[in-house]
Amino acid sequence: PGPPAGSPRVSSDPRADLDSAVLLTRSLLADTRQLAAQMRDKFPADGDHSLDSLPTLAMSAGTLGSLQLPGVLTRLRVDLMSYLRHVQWLRRAGGPSLKTLEPELGALQARLERLLRRLQLLMSRLALPQAAPDQPVIPLGPPASAWGSIRAAHAILGGLHLTLDWAVRGLLLLKTRL
């Protein structure tokens, strides 16, 4: 008998997954930028806002050159999972002032979930370690006031914007190494 029948190709391979992750990240970055601009129009920010429960920015321009595939993907996945939790929290506890942004926040959440699935698929296909988030999950209590939820939204969108910005650069750099 001849060799056994092969398997048909599945829909994508790791390099295509990485391309897809770059496109999804770019698209999410554009959405976040647009939503942050809407927030600034509706609720002008008085300076920079921060939230202790948000992840610290993983990368700076100086560290981009030394990036390694596992580290970037693991850190990006953990940080995006944190931002996903924060977006879910905003939608749930943001109060009436943020209700007008509900369709956009819902779309942002769906895109974030899709990107996370793509990153996990890529890590599985490459057989890279997929550590669970090692930092304890900080319970997110309700915002102290309507203004508190607006400040939180500014902080979340601002942080997500910066994270996605380095993610696009990092993923593009990793493409050359796969």
Partner: antibody
Framework: EVQLLESGGGLVQPGGSLRLSCAAS????????MHWVRQAPGKGLEWVAV????????YYADSVKGRFTISRDNSKNTLYLQMNSLRAEDTAVYYC???????WGQGTLVTVSS | QSVLTQPPSASGTPGQRVTISCSGS?????????VHWYQQLPGTAPKLLIY???ERPSGVPDRFSGSKSGTSASLAISGLRSEDEADYYC???????????FGGGTKLTVL
């Protein structure tokens, strides 16, 4: 078309050794993590070991840790499993699988018996 | 004892819809790890049926669909056919193993 072809199975005595090979074709082998998964007769699937696309990460199921070694040669598009100190409970069909796993070979039977 | 729990058997008549469940824990499926489904026809190697909870590889009919919620996932097969008679396995990444874990498998019988 993707092909994964296992070889090296056979009958071995308890305490003995075997080396399984898996020849890959039809896809970019060096871009995929590779697994060994086994299936004892009449039982379910049990993950055995995985090696990352570039060979830098290797992980094993507790049941084979310290006895089995997974390795790969990307220049030859080949995956290996060195099995030492074999036990009766290692008797199974051993599948080589790529990716999620997305692709599976047809398997090779390893029988450990005296 | 599998880390992911599946019913050992399921059955249905041609044309029917059947669902197979896969229950995990907060350390695998509940931690955001995706679920994949495999079909193993008698005497053959497993074949990827659903990946990333709900995605179908090319060539898999749209009668097969997957979903995930919380710590569990399910595979639905609509318009059941005799050729669907097989063993079905779910799998998910388990960070404590740094590898995938498989469910115990569900034997589907088409009556």
């Amino acid at each position: 078309e993707v092909q994964l072809l296992e070889s090296g199975g056979g009958l071995v005595q308890p305490g003995g050794s075997l080396r399984l090979s898996c020849a890959a074709s039809g896809f970019t082998f060096s871009s995929y993590g590779m697994h060994w998964v086994r299936q004892a007769p009449g039982k379910g699937l049990e993950w055995v070991a995985v090696i990352s696309y570039d060979g830098s990460y290797k992980y094993y199921a507790d049941s084979v840790k310290g006895r089995f070694t997974i390795s790969r040669d990307n220049s030859k598009n080949t995956l290996y499993l060195q099995m030492n100190s074999l036990r009766a409970e290692d008797t199974a069909v051993y599948y080589c699988a790529a990716g999620v796993p997305d692709y599976w070979g047809q398997g090779t039977l390893v029988t450990v018996s005296s | 004892q599998s880390v992911l729990t599946q019913p050992p058997s399921a059955s249905g008549t041609p044309g029917q819809r059947v669902t197979i469940s896969c229950s995990g824990s907060s350390s695998n499926i509940g931690s955001g790890y995706d679920v994949h489904w495999y079909q193993q026809l008698p005497g053959t190697a497993p074949k990827l049926l659903i990946y990333s909870n709900e995605e179908r590889p090319s060539g898999v009919p749209d009668r097969f669909s997957g979903s995930k919620s919380g710590t569990s996932a399910s595979l639905a097969i609509s318009g059941l056919r005799s050729e669907d008679e097989a063993d079905y396995y779910c799998a998910a990444w388990d960070p404590s193993l740094s590898g995938p874990v498989f469910g115990g498998g569900t034997k589907l019988t088409v009556l």
